[in-house]
Interface confidence: medium
């Protein structure tokens, strides 16, 4: 490690004094110190002499001697004070640039160590420091502002008390650069707007960023609007707000509005659409078919989409019959708002009963009037079958009645033996009745059909079965002739309970 003579950490001299600093090392040595006038340098092998015969306050600073060839990089230092009664400060740099949250060293060096007790840091023009400015002072190095913030980008002066009065240094400009994450954040309110001609409207475009240097504007279609800007600063963000107030809207105000903000990192934009209408409107629609078919016992949700302006003043679901005067339970009706002008209304019908088939109407009202949308709900049933033996026009006839929805198809089977249900091996004959007679077909009710099978003579060791089926299921009835008369067998499983 090099050695400096005089071997003291600090040296205090008066202006005009001669100062000689000698550094001796094992190999060649080099001096490093503040850039200042009047120094002469003399090197002789392993020693180097720095000297001046006219020291000034500008020579105040720390002089370091290093040995470039030393692998350990050892150095020695001495701090020189040139105490000038008129110049308490030696400012090494008048501009300091740091990034936010770094420490910023303002290099005003005190020329007299005795003055340390009375030093302070102020902003130029006597302004106090920003609140939360955390700083420390070292007479060798100056003032350090710890974890500098962008807002602390100011001009500073170092102040020292000399003989009861404050003496300021020349100013040091601190530039604290923000680390800007990206373009400004944007909001455009509302996301969509509808107004009747003549009404008032307001559109608010606001942008915020950690840095004050950004631009924001609002444009209508492709025209930039001239709107006064309101500025604010909170939550450590700069905010710029443009508010467009329209007292009486007209059709020319309609169209696309874009809020655009930009900074050095780039541009952000967001848009909304403004509709101007002649009068109030109320539109009801459904993505579902208005004619619904559901199997009995299952559930159904009826959904209505409403587009309205102004907002709804009333709405409800109504059951229009034909079965009973029951009304949908309010707890089964549900409303969700997609956005300001569009809503979805849902009626839940769980585990549908036969008496719940019929017409359901959704009614809504706004200043534009009443509107209704009606659903027709028909329940599907698997067929129920019954067979009787009768004489028609003197001929023995098997009469099969089948009831269900949709309309059942009828098939007759004749099979050998007595059985509850004909299976393939037993079948002797099959007759399809493509056009059974419709006995009843009222809306929302089951369809009842009748099929006749004329039988000249009943074979007593045989079974006659009427089968009916539709899209929901099937039903059957087995007729077994007995010498003592006809015997019928409805299938065990068909005890229909909705």
């Amino acid at each position: 490690i090099p050695v400096i003579e005089p071997s003291v950490p600090e040296l205090v001299v008066k202006p005009g004094a001669t100062v000689t600093l000698r550094c001796v090392g094992n190999g060649s040595v080099e001096w490093d110190g503040p850039p200042s006038p009047h120094w002469t340098l003399y090197s002789d092998g392993s020693s180097s002499i720095l000297s001046t015969n006219n020291a000034t306050f500008q020579n105040t600073g720390t002089y370091r001697c290093t040995e470039p060839g030393d692998p350990l990089g050892g150095s020695a230092a001495i701090h020189l004070y040139v105490k000038d009664p008129a110049r308490p400060w030696n400012v090494l740099a008048q501009e300091v640039v740091v990034f936010e949250d770094q420490d910023a060293l303002l290099p005003c060096l005190l020329t007299d160590p005795v003055l340390e007790a009375g030093v302070s840091l102020v902003r130029v023009r006597g302004r106090p420091l920003m609140r939360h400015t955390n700083y420390s002072f070292s007479p060798w190095h100056g003032f350090t502002i710890h974890r500098a913030k962008f807002i602390q980008s100011q001009d500073y002066q170092c102040s020292a008390l000399m003989g009861g009065r404050k003496v300021m240094s020349i100013s040091i400009r601190l530039k604290v650069q923000k680390v800007i994450p990206g373009p400004p954040a944007l909001t455009l309110v509302p996301a969509e707007l509808v107004r009747i001609r003549g009404e008032a409207a307001q559109i608010v475009c606001s942008a915020s960023s950690v840095d004050v240097n950004f631009d924001v504007f609002l444009q209508h279609n492709n025209t930039k609007l001239a709107i006064p800007q309101q500025s604010d600063f909170h939550n450590n963000r700069y905010q710029k707000v443009l508010t467009l107030n329209l007292d009486q809207v007209d059709f020319q105000h309609a169209g696309n509005y874009s809020c655009v903000a930009s900074n050095v990192q780039g541009k952000h934009s967001t848009s909304m659409f403004f509709r101007v209408v002649e009068s109030a409107y109320l539109n009801l629609s459904s993505e579902q078919n208005l004619i619904q078919e559901v199997t009995v016992g299952e559930g159904l949700n009826l959904k209505v989409m409403v587009e309205a302006y102004p907002g709804l003043q009333g709405f409800n679901w109504t059951y229009l019959g034909p079965f009973s005067d029951h009304q949908p339970e309010p707890k089964l009706a549900n409303a969700t708002t997609k956005d300001t002008y569009r809503h979805t209304f849902t009626l839940s019908l769980p585990r549908l009963k036969p008496s719940e088939a019929g017409r359901y109407s959704f009614l809504a009202r706004n200043p534009g009037g009443w509107r209704a949308l009606t659903f027709e709900l028909t329940l599907r049933y698997p067929p129920e079958v019954s067979v009787i033996w009768t004489f028609i026009n003197g001929s023995g006839t098997l009469l099969c009645a089948a009831s269900g929805y949709p309309q059942p198809n009828v098939t007759w089977l004749q099979c050998s033996g007595h059985t509850d249900r004909c299976d393939e091996a037993q079948v002797l004959q099959v007759w399809d009745d493509p056009y059974p007679e419709v006995l009843s077909q009222e809306p929302f009710h089951k369809v009842t059909v009748q099929s006749l099978l004329t039988v000249e003579t009943l074979e007593h060791n045989q079974t006659y079965e009427c089968r009916a089926h539709n899209s929901v299921g099937s039903g059957s009835w087995a007729f077994i002739p007995i010498s003592a008369g006809a015997h019928t067998h409805p299938p065990d499983e068909f005890l229909f309970t909705p």
Partner: antibody, heavy 119, light 113 residues
């Protein structure tokens, strides 16, 4: 909530000194500069100077230099303003005011202390 | 020192009507370093201490109604009250703090007609 409670009214002879106190509560006393502003009867506002309660460093308006001394006692969160060599035109209400961010604005004010200088 | 001049010195206003107070400085209050304009507005209601209304040209202080707004640039500034209410009576002061000593305008007395 933030409060600045000042000492009571004073009547002084010309040439005397007066020391007005300002006790802060509801916030960290050392975190905000304190300013002193005065208002002569029926007149406007006049800034006198500031003190940094954290370090005690001060800055006075040139008009009051040599006559005013601003001090603080952090243990009791109190700032003081002493004005010496009083003259009759020093008769005024003296306000302490908290500095919001350093160099103003003054977001909270004391209720004021009336100092009357009369022979 | 920077001289602050307010006009008018007295302002009679009908409740619900707007009001405007002007303030002029003898030199620019714009700090070219940070882009801020160091002008504040205070209201001193009768028998009370001053209270902060607007700071750094246009920022409303906490709790101040949005009917108060500040604007201007360089050396000419305006405080606007969109709809005056009875509680707004008092003396309004502008204050510069671009450099110390801070200086105040002479005040504008707002009274209800």
């Amino acid at each position: 909530q933030v409060q600045l409670e000042q000492s009571g009214a004073e009547v002084k002879r010309p040439g005397a000194s007066v020391k007005v106190s300002c006790k802060a509560s509801g916030y960290t006393f050392t975190g905000y500069y304190m300013h002193w502003v005065r208002q002569a009867p029926g007149q406007g506002l006049e800034w006198m100077g500031w003190i940094n309660p954290n370090r005690g460093d001060t800055n006075y308006a040139q008009k009051f230099q040599g006559r005013v001394t601003m001090t603080r006692d952090t243990s009791i969160s109190t700032a003081y303003m002493e004005l010496s060599r009083l003259r009759s035109d020093d008769t005024a209400v003296y306000y302490c005011a908290r500095d919001l961010e350093g160099g103003g604005p003054f977001d909270y004010w004391g209720q004021g202390t009336l100092v009357t200088v009369s022979s | 020192d920077i001289v602050m001049t307010q006009t008018p010195l007295s302002l009679p206003v009908t409740p619900g009507e707007p009001a405007s107070i002007s303030c002029r400085s003898s030199q620019s209050l714009l700090d070219s370093d940070d882009g801020n304009t160091y002008l504040d507005w205070y209201l001193q209601k009768p028998g009370q201490s001053p209270q902060l209304l607007i700071y750094t040209l246009s920022y409303r202080a906490s709790g101040v109604p949005d009917r108060f707004s500040g604007s201007g640039s360089g050396t000419d500034f305006t405080l606007k009250i969109s709809r005056v209410e009875a509680e707004d009576v008092g003396v309004y002061y502008c204050m510069q703090r671009i450099e110390f000593p801070s200086t105040f305008g002479q005040g504008t007395r707002l009274e209800i007609k």
